[in-house]
Interface confidence: medium
């Protein structure tokens, strides 16, 4: 629990090991300068948006590393007593919305699995990842269009739902994982896209940006 | 500051050939797709040509207008881009920008574009 | 694939006016909006639709509804007047669109 010195420490996202990063960039660029960290995140958040995801990459694969170890360290980790409850997750809110991405695999998957019917489904996830990643914007854009409006929608549907309240008991637990749920999508709701370029001061200058309209 | 600057134009005749180019600094120049647009003279703009970057094998696409007659290359070393035009009409004859259509800007994406001044290519006999 | 916009459009200084733009992509594809003045400098004013790049007044905005994108220009100034056009990407062609282009006449 919260006082559990020996729980193992959570897993970090993508997005953190980005923003751990750029703190750290910043710190070693403007070593005494203090920082507003509000107008950081923003700015972080801004950039993480129309990152390519090329490089968006080495933070998932970061990511990833994080998740292993983590669940790795799970599996001898013994809670204490009374540590078990799961959060209430009520059935009848909002489902969350595809991402742009998430559209794409629903729309190639099919084909995927037409083409190669003997791919195993981490195979195919793979597969869609990389044609995900070689599109180019522009032809990226029909399912990012498509995800903010289903977005939209969600973001009226929550708040309707939100303003009814929700069942007493839950309400605790549920407000806490929707905030923390609303940081993410705040983070994470744009795809990667293929178009921005990097100015010189920035590192990785080799990886592949081109364009193609955002 | 970033800085797109073409040359190379001026009059020819109709099935002549003219090489622009257009000099960039200011950016990564081998992370960014290229493109060139022209204007007819009191017409609208026009997209001309785009070239990909190295891990896009290069790709180029043109507009119909051009295609088969102009071919669009790129230098990284140099961070110079090129239009070969050859037989040239005198429907070619506009000012030609060079653009690089996208930058973030530190950590921040200002989504401001970059335009050349153009470049006048006349075509008459 | 076409993007259709008016070729011209007046406002009285410090009035509201709108430009369209029209195209049977745009609910698939985002709009960009171009500012050329009669020097024939351009600068992008809007993009992803209703985004301002940094530099921009704020009195510019841009919407997109169905198969129209729209950019406003409010409070509108003398330095407003200018040529405006649209741009969308289409897949097919691998080369953006610009619409004709709005000619923008502010009246003292």
């Known amino acids: 629990g919260k006082g559990d010195p020996k729980k193992p420490r959570g897993k970090m996202s993508s997005y953190a090991f980005f923003v751990q990063t750029c703190r750290e960039e910043h710190k070693k660029k403007h070593p005494d300068a203090s920082v507003n960290f509000s107008e950081f995140s923003k700015k972080c958040s801004e950039r993480w948006k129309t990152m390519s995801a090329k490089e968006k990459g080495k933070f998932e694969d970061m990511a990833k590393a994080d998740k292993a170890r983590y669940e790795r360290e799970m599996k001898t980790y013994i809670p204490p007593k009374g540590e078990t409850k799961k959060k209430f997750k009520d059935p009848n809110a909002p489902k969350r919305p595809p991402s742009a991405f998430f559209l794409f695999c629903s729309e190639y998957r099919p084909k995927i699995k037409g083409e190669h019917p003997g791919l195993s489904i981490g195979d195919v996830a793979k597969k869609l990842g990389e044609m995900w990643n070689n599109t180019a914007a522009d032809d990226k854009q029909p399912y990012e269009k498509k995800a903010a409006k289903l977005k939209e929608k969600y973001e009226k549907d929550i708040a309707a739902y939100r303003a009814k309240g929700k069942p007493d008991a839950a309400k605790k637990g549920v407000v806490k994982a929707e905030k923390s749920k609303k940081k993410k999508e705040e983070e994470e709701d744009e795809e990667d896209e293929e178009d921005e370029e990097e100015e010189e001061d920035e590192e990785d200058e080799e990886e592949e940006e081109d364009d193609d309209d955002e | 500051a970033v800085q797109l600057v073409e040359s190379g134009g001026g009059l020819v005749q109709p099935k002549e050939s003219l090489k622009i180019s257009c000099a960039a600094s200011g950016f990564t120049f081998s992370n960014a797709a290229m493109y060139w647009v022209r204007q007819a003279p009191g017409k609208g703009l026009e997209w001309v040509a785009r070239?990909?970057?190295?891990?896009?094998?290069?790709?180029?696409y043109y507009a119909d207008s051009v295609k088969g007659r102009f071919t669009i290359s790129r230098d990284d070393s140099k961070s110079m881009v090129y239009l070969q035009m050859d037989n040239l009409k005198t429907e070619d004859t506009a000012m030609y920008y060079c653009?690089?259509?996208?930058?973030?800007?530190?950590?921040?994406?200002?989504?401001?574009?970059?335009w050349g001044q153009g470049v006048m290519v006349t075509v008459s006999s | 694939y076409e993007l259709i916009q008016p070729p011209s459009a007046s406002v009285t200084l410090g009035n509201t006016v709108s430009i369209t733009c029209s195209g049977d992509e745009l609910p698939k594809r985002y709009a960009y909006w171009y500012q050329q003045k009669p020097d024939k400098s351009i600068v992008r004013v809007i993009y992803?639709?209703?985004e301002r790049p940094s530099g921009i007044s704020d009195r510019f905005s841009g919407s997109s509804s169905g198969t129209t994108a729209t950019l406003t220009i409010s409070d509108t100034q003398a330095e407003d007047e200018a040529d405006y056009y649209c741009?969308?990407?289409?897949?097919?062609?691998?080369?953006?669109?610009f619409g004709g282009g709005t000619k923008l006449t502010v009246l003292g």
């Open positions: 992803k639709d209703s």
């Open positions: 070239i990909r970057t190295k891990p896009n094998n290069y790709a180029t």
């Open positions: 741009h969308s990407t289409y897949s097919d062609d691998k080369l953006p669109v």
């Open positions: 653009t690089a259509p996208r930058r973030t800007e530190g950590i921040v994406s200002s989504g401001v574009d970059y």
